[in-house]
Amino acid sequence: IPTEIPASALVKETLALLSTHRTLLIANETLRIPVPVHKNHQLCTEEIFQGIGTLESQTVQGGTVERLFKNLSLIKKYIGGQKKKCGEERRRVNQFLDYLQEFLGVMNTEWIIESH
Amino acid sequence: IPTEIPASALVKETLALLSTHRTLLIANETLRIPVPVHKNHQLCTEEIFQGIGTLESQTVQGGTVERLFKNLSLIKKYIGGQKKKCGEERRRVNQFLDYLQEFLGVMNTEWIIESH
């Protein structure tokens, strides 16, 4: 993410552009894109960005819609950077267990887990 | 995940076992495992389960610690199932845009984005 625009501001601007250009983006009535069927979004980043790629290739570029896809490309880069940070630091088992506990805690409280 | 234990109950039980067996799990003082340095846990599921594998191979099995690793294996399976559901359904662009908007909205409100 370039230092001149923080990730949080980038996300906000992208949300606004997405809303503005919705009718332009849905112009292709026949296009079908894979949509995840659960709300644990972070698990699906690859599929989301593949979908964005499909959409971009089908959308007439120009003006601020170009800005939208540029932003989405920067967000993809940011997430790629975050994914890199998943395995960069080798630490004691204590600290790994802390992370695992946090992960399970988040699963326990924030994940949408369908009942079986 | 077997139908006899819902995922949410499994996660709760695993958290309790993790706490109980902490000293057993950190018995190898020299072992180092990659620990993600941000809190967007779902981005790091692969690395987390690789770490669990490393830990399991270094831990003396038996008793309820075996139950802990069995549970973690079931959670991994559950997450694998969720990842599969990321690309199963092909939908209209409107629905993809709805999902993208939710994803960015979650990024905007819930992700831990470091300031640059």
Partner: antibody
């Protein structure tokens, strides 16, 4: 209520050794690490190291590696620290403290052992 | 070793808000804990992992920060809060403590 009861004050000569104890009660001793911390007169705190009562494994601050030896007796739920080749700089209060588990904060502390090195 | 720098002393009146800072010489993610020590007593855990309130500690105490800059806040300060406050990190070996901040009440 978790308690860590430490042994009494010690007056020792330079070059001698001292072994202090820390008796834990009201929790499962083998489920939490025990740390040792030094506090010199009017000074800050220094982490000496910890022992895992489950395995007997230890992690030391490099600075204290040749000075301190940490051990445990699981049956009496007691942790020990032996400090050897004492010098005047070793005069301090020594605390044992329980590790709280998640993120390893020191959640319960003993009352401290005052060690005075004097010839 | 990771050096933790705290200002040596602060003086506040009861009822005021006070912030005690701790700056680390290198990044610690959120592995910072805070302790209170009164004269003649052992330290007492207040905050663990930067922002989590330890069991039995009044909600007047709070912690914030990540990376290299951390803060312990007491709001409002009470007469009983006169003590020395230590920060401690355990992200890097060896674990280290700050020099302590002595909080005096006016």
């Amino acid at each position: 209520q978790v308690k860590l009861l430490q042994s009494g004050a010690a007056l020792v000569k330079p070059g001698d050794s001292v072994k202090m104890s820390c008796k834990a009660s009201d929790y499962t001793f083998t489920e939490y690490l025990i740390h040792w911390v030094k506090q010199s007169q009017g000074r800050s705190l220094e982490w000496i190291g910890y022992i895992n009562p489950y395995s007997g494994g230890t992690v030391y601050n490099e600075k204290f590696k040749s000075k301190a030896t940490l051990t445990v007796d699981k049956f009496s739920s007691t942790a020990y620290m032996e400090f050897r080749r004492l010098t005047f700089e070793d005069s301090a209060i020594y605390y044992c403290a329980r590790d709280g588990g998640y993120s390893d904060p020191l959640d319960y502390w003993g009352q401290g052992v005052m060690v005075t090195v004097s010839s | 070793d990771t050096v933790l720098t705290q200002s040596p002393a602060l003086a506040v009146s009861p009822g005021e808000r006070v912030s005690i800072s701790c700056r680390a010489s290198e990044g610690l993610t959120s592995y910072m804990h805070w302790y209170q020590q009164k004269p003649g007593q052992q330290p007492k855990l207040l905050i663990y992992k930067a922002s989590n309130l330890a069991s039995g500690v009044p909600a007047r105490f709070s912690g914030s920060g990540s990376g290299t800059d951390f803060t312990l806040t007491i709001d409002p300060v009470e007469a009983d809060d006169a003590a020395t406050y230590f920060c401690q990190q355990n992200w890097n070996d060896p674990w280290t403590f700050g020099g302590g901040t002595k909080l005096e009440l006016k």
